[in-house]
Structures are given as C-alpha cells and as structure tokens.
C-alpha cells in the first residue's frame, strides 16, 4: 500500500524517489504521473526524464535534487487541496518489464492559521525508505514513509521485524534507492 506524505496548502510538497545509476551519467528514464502506476509508463504525466535530461515537465512540478545521481524526488510547488492523491514514480529500467514502480500518496492539509510563521519541515532531512520485492515482472513496493531522527538501533530493529516479510528483500541505508546494473 502507499505511504502518506503530507504538506499544507501553500507549501511545497516533496515525494521521494531514488535510484543508483550503474555509472555516473548512465541515466535511466523516469516518469512521474498523478495516479497509481499503470502497466506502462505513467498516467497523467507531470514530469519525465530520459537518458540525458528532463525532457517534459509541467508548471509547479520539478526535480530539486541531482537527478544525474539518481535523485528523482518530485517537488510540487505551492500545493492546493486538488494536489492530493496518489503519485507514481516509475524508474524505466531497460529490458522487458524491469521497471520499478512506486506509488506515493500525498495528503494536503488546509493551512494552519498561526500568528507567527512556522518553519516548513525539511523533508529532505527525513528518512524515507523503500522496500522492494525483486522477481519476475513489475516490482511490488512499499514505502515506510518518513522516519526522522532514526538511529542505528531502530534501523536494526526495523530490519529484524521485516526480515520475514516478502516486501523486505531490500532494506537500504540510502533512502528509497534502486540500484541499477
């Protein structure tokens, strides 16, 4: 199932998605779409990269990280309630149906009316994790969400708890990372 990522109206939302290129500059096409990942590509594409660059984008959607190093996390600028829903990050690995598909749920909350401005949470400092099933056909993935202030004991405990889960083939220390090659 999808894990929820939250933002308030007027903030920027951050949806994490990463992969590790086989070699520097050896990029894999990625698409982001609004809606659960379909069998091919992304539905309602909002952003797409190819082997070299971002080749399609729509207003308010951009990649804030270094996509050439595999950080294809999506930033949605100045969100509204209409931005709520499931987003698909699809890493289009060459070969027949080798793609990795991640469905991330964005929940937009109404802006809090506060007398003093509050600092927007730095999502990039959080600890999004992706567990990936490997095997024939498209991967099943489950995001465990943002886990700020996690320590090594917690990571170890988490790994032990999930060792027997079929979704726990691949617990990584570098975020929601898919290693290519």
């Amino acid at each position: 199932s999808e894990v929820e990522y939250r933002a308030e109206v007027g903030q920027n939302a951050y949806l994490p998605c990463f992969y590790t290129p086989a070699a520097p500059g050896n990029l894999v096409p990625v698409c982001w779409g609004k809606g659960a990942c379909p069998v091919f590509e992304c539905g309602n594409v909002v952003l797409r990269t190819d082997e070299r660059d971002v080749n399609y984008w729509t207003s308010r959607y951009w990649l804030n990280g270094d996509f050439r190093k595999g950080d294809v996390s999506l930033t949605i600028e100045n969100v509204t309630l209409a931005d709520s829903g499931i987003y698909c990050c699809r890493i289009q690995i060459p070969g027949i149906m080798n793609d990795e598909k991640f469905n991330l749920k964005l929940v937009i909350k109404p802006a809090k009316v506060t007398p003093a401005p509050t600092r927007q949470r730095d999502f990039t400092a959080a600890f999004p994790r992706m567990l990936t099933t490997r095997g024939h056909g498209p991967a099943e993935t489950q995001t465990l969400g943002s886990l700020p202030d996690i320590n090594l004991t917690q990571i170890s405990t988490l790994a032990n708890e999930l060792r027997d889960s079929r979704l726990a083939n691949d617990l990584r220390d570098s975020g929601a990372t898919i290693r290519i090659g």
């Epitope: 096409p29 809606g35 659960a36 379909p38 069998v39 091919f40 590509e41 539905g43 190819d50 056909g137």
Partner: antibody, heavy 124, light 107 residues
C-alpha cells in the same frame, strides 16, 4: 482524424513468418506521447496483447512473455508505419490481428484507436 | 498475470432496459480498467477508462464503476445499436489482460 490501416497476407504456412504492417495517418509513429501495439483475437484465446513500441527520445519496446522469443515490432519513420513479425508460427497463431494506438488521454495500457483487423490463418 | 472474469457470458435484454456487466480481477487493479464494445465483424471501441471515465464521444448511457477487484459496466436504456460484445481490460499490471467478453442481445 487518427486512422490505422493494416495490410499483410491472410494465409501463412506453419513454421513461416507472419508479417503485418500498420500505416498511421493523423499522427506520427515517433510521437512522444503515443505507443503502438499489436493485439490479436481468437475464439480460443480471446483478446491477447502481443507487444508495443514507442518513442521517448529513443525507441523502446515491450512484449508478452508468451511470444517474446518470436516477435519483432519495428517502427518505420520514413513511411510513418509500424510492423509486426511473428516467427515460427503454428495453427495456434491463427487469429484476427489488430494494430492499435494507446496514449491519447495521457494514460497508457489501454487502446484508443484500433486498426480494422486482419484475419491471419496459419495452415499448410 | 491478472485474470479477469466477466459475467454473464451472454444476456438477452429488452430495448430500454438497463444492462449491468461485471468484471472481477484476480487481484487489486487500482481502477486500471477499461471497457470496450465490439460489434460483429468490427474492431473493439473504447467506452470507459480508469474504471469510470467516459471516453470522448461515447453516449452518456454508458457508465463504469467499481474499485479493488470488482468492476461493472452499466448501459442505461439499452438501444438497438448497443447489440455487441463487451470486454473489460486491466492495465495495472503486466501483461495487459482482457476479460473473455459478454455478448448482449435484444430479447
């Protein structure tokens, strides 16, 4: 108005290669938002997706596992068409073959436009 | 692969009546479902996508609904031109797969 016009022989001998072509009008085979499919239909197997080719800065393709060792789908940008080749056919490959376009509404995986269909019989 | 089971296989209905066709998926397909109409000797035509979105130009008497593994196509006030076979197709998981079809006839 987008149209797909199929051509190719209706009779193929067992062990030979089935070859069909789909000519596109009203769109480009190298469109960045379309994908071009072959689907077949037979009484015994119903509708069966065979494969697709599409252009996203370069050409990609995907195929059904059941035919992946025998199938080729090639785009021809000079003629704005794409073709199907299915090798080593058997009578089980007898079907109506359709070319088809997906991607019109921004979603992929289902078909917006279909060719007229070609009945291909595999028989000696 | 995901198996789609349509029911009924065929039905005979009077003009003006409402028709409901069911499509059950072997696992959750997250609304990645399309419906097609195929008249005898013709190619299939798209009616519904994303489980409930009406394709451009399709009469409003057609509607789709459902979620998870259970989906349905409804034809309100059946017309003579609706005599056809109807197919569901999932496009959530590889490979795309189709239901076996439902043949709709006039009583």
């Amino acid at each position: 108005q987008m149209q797909l016009q199929q051509s190719g022989p209706g009779l193929v001998k067992p062990s030979q290669t089935l070859s069909l072509t789909c000519a596109i009008s009203g769109d480009s085979v190298s469109s960045n938002s379309a994908a071009w499919n072959w689907i077949r239909q037979s009484p015994s197997r119903g509708l069966e997706w065979l494969g697709r080719t599409y252009y996203r800065s370069k050409w990609y393709s995907a195929f059904a596992v059941s035919v992946k060792s025998r199938i080729t789908i090639n785009p021809d940008t000079s003629k704005n068409q794409f073709s199907l080749q299915l090798n080593s056919v058997t009578p089980e490959d007898t079907a109506v073959y359709y070319c088809a376009r997906e991607g019109s509404s921004g979603w992929y995986g289902y078909v917006h436009h279909w060719g007229q269909g070609t009945l291909v019989t595999v028989s000696s | 692969e995901i198996v789609l089971t349509q029911s009924p296989a065929s039905l005979s209905v009077s003009l003006g009546e409402t028709v409901t066709i069911e499509c059950r998926a072997s696992e959750d397909i997250y609304n990645g479902l399309a419906w097609y109409q195929q008249k005898p000797g013709k190619s299939p035509q798209l009616l519904i996508y994303n489980a409930n979105s009406l394709h451009t130009g399709v009469p409003s008497r057609f509607s789709g609904s459902g979620s998870g593994t259970q989906y349905s196509l409804k034809i309100n006030s059946l017309q003579s031109e609706d005599v056809a076979s109807y197919f569901c197709q999932q496009y959530y998981d590889y490979p795309p797969t189709f239901g076996q079809g439902t043949k709709v006839e006039i009583k």
